[in-house]
Interface confidence: medium
Amino acid sequence: QEEGQVEGQDEDIPPITCVQNGLRYHDRDVWKPEPCRICVCDNGKVLCDDVICDETKNCPGAEVPEGECCPVCPDGSESPTDQETTGVEGPKGDTGPRGPRGPAGPPGRDGIPGQPGLPGPPGPPGPPGPPGLGGNFAP
C-alpha cells in the first residue's frame, strides 16, 4: 500500500491535499491509517469511517490476519454455502449525507487502492464532482 508524502515543515499546504499524522494525501486518495479505519481526502478535508466486517458464520476457525481488520476463514474450512458466496460483496449500508464540498485541485498520484468492496480512485476530474463518502465500508 502506497504511503502519503511526508509533509515538509516549510512547505505550503494547499487545498488539493490533506495532511494526517504528518503524511500528505492528494485529493481523492483513500488510505487506512489503522486496520479498522479507512479515510479519504475529499477536496482538502479528511473524512474517515470505521471498517464494517462481514459476519463469518459457518466458519468457526476464522482469524484476523496480521495488519488486517476483519476475520477470514482459513483455506478449505468454509462450508459449501460459504464457498458459493466467497468474494461476493454484501449489501451496502445506507449512504451517509453528502457533506459540503471543499476546494479541489488537480489530482497528484493515483489514489491508494481501496480494500475489496471499496471503489477504486476515480480518473481525472470532471463534472460532476466526487461523491460524498459513504456511511459504511465493506472490506
Epitope: P15, P100, G102
Partner: antibody, heavy 119, light 107 residues
Framework: EVQLQQSGAELARPGGSVKLSCKAS????????MQWLRQSPGRGLEWIGV????????RYTQKFQGKATLTADKSSSTAYMQLSSLASEDSAVYYC????????????WGQGTTVTVSS | DIQLTQSPKSMSMSVGERVTLSCKAS??????VSWYQQRPEQSPKLLIY???NRCTGVPDRFTGSGSGTDFTLTISSVQAEDLADYHC?????????FGAGTKLEIK
Amino acid sequence: EVQLQQSGAELARPGGSVKLSCKASGYSFTAYWMQWLRQSPGRGLEWIGVIYPGDGDARYTQKFQGKATLTADKSSSTAYMQLSSLASEDSAVYYCARWFHHDYVMDYWGQGTTVTVSS
Amino acid sequence: DIQLTQSPKSMSMSVGERVTLSCKASENVGTYVSWYQQRPEQSPKLLIYGASNRCTGVPDRFTGSGSGTDFTLTISSVQAEDLADYHCGQIYNYPLTFGAGTKLEIK
C-alpha cells in the same frame, strides 16, 4: 446570482496594518473555499492564501505567512484578510475569489480593494 | 514555483482579425491552465478552464488549447469589447501562479 463585494480602498502607513473584507452572497458561503490574491504592476497576479469558511481552516503561500491572516464570519457570510507590517511593496489591488472545486477554477471574483502604503 | 510566460506582452489588432495568445509553463502542468480576461479597471473574469473548456456565457470566438507546457488562447474574430489584459494561470500545483499578461489593444 453569486456576488463577492469587497471593502473600499485603504491608505496605510508603513509598518501599519489593514483588514479587508469580502462579503459573499448568492451561494452557500461555508461550502466553498475562498482564495485571496493580489495584483500589482510590477508583479502581476500573486496568490496569497485560501480559507474554508465552514471551519476556518486557512492556508497560506510561504511568502505571505505572517503577513496575511485569513478569517471568516459565517453569520455575515464575510471573509476577511488582515495584512500587517505593511511596506510600500504591499501597495496593490487585493482580490477575493470563490474556488469552484468542481472544475478547479476561481469562478467569481470580487471587484478588488486598492491598498496604498505610503508615509 | 511554476513559472508561466505569456507572449506577446501586448498586441494591437483590428476588429475581425484572428488573435493568438501564448502561455508557456516552466514544467508540465497537464491541462490545469485557466485563462482570464481583465478589462480596464475591472477584476479578472474566467474565460477558459482546463485548458480548453469555455466558461458559461463566454462567446464561442474564444478557444483554448494545449497541454503539458504550451497553451494558446485564440480569438477567432476580435471585437471592440475584447480590449483587455489576458492572463493565464496554472492550478496544477501550489502556489497558484499566473503569467504577466498580454495586453490586447484594438486599432
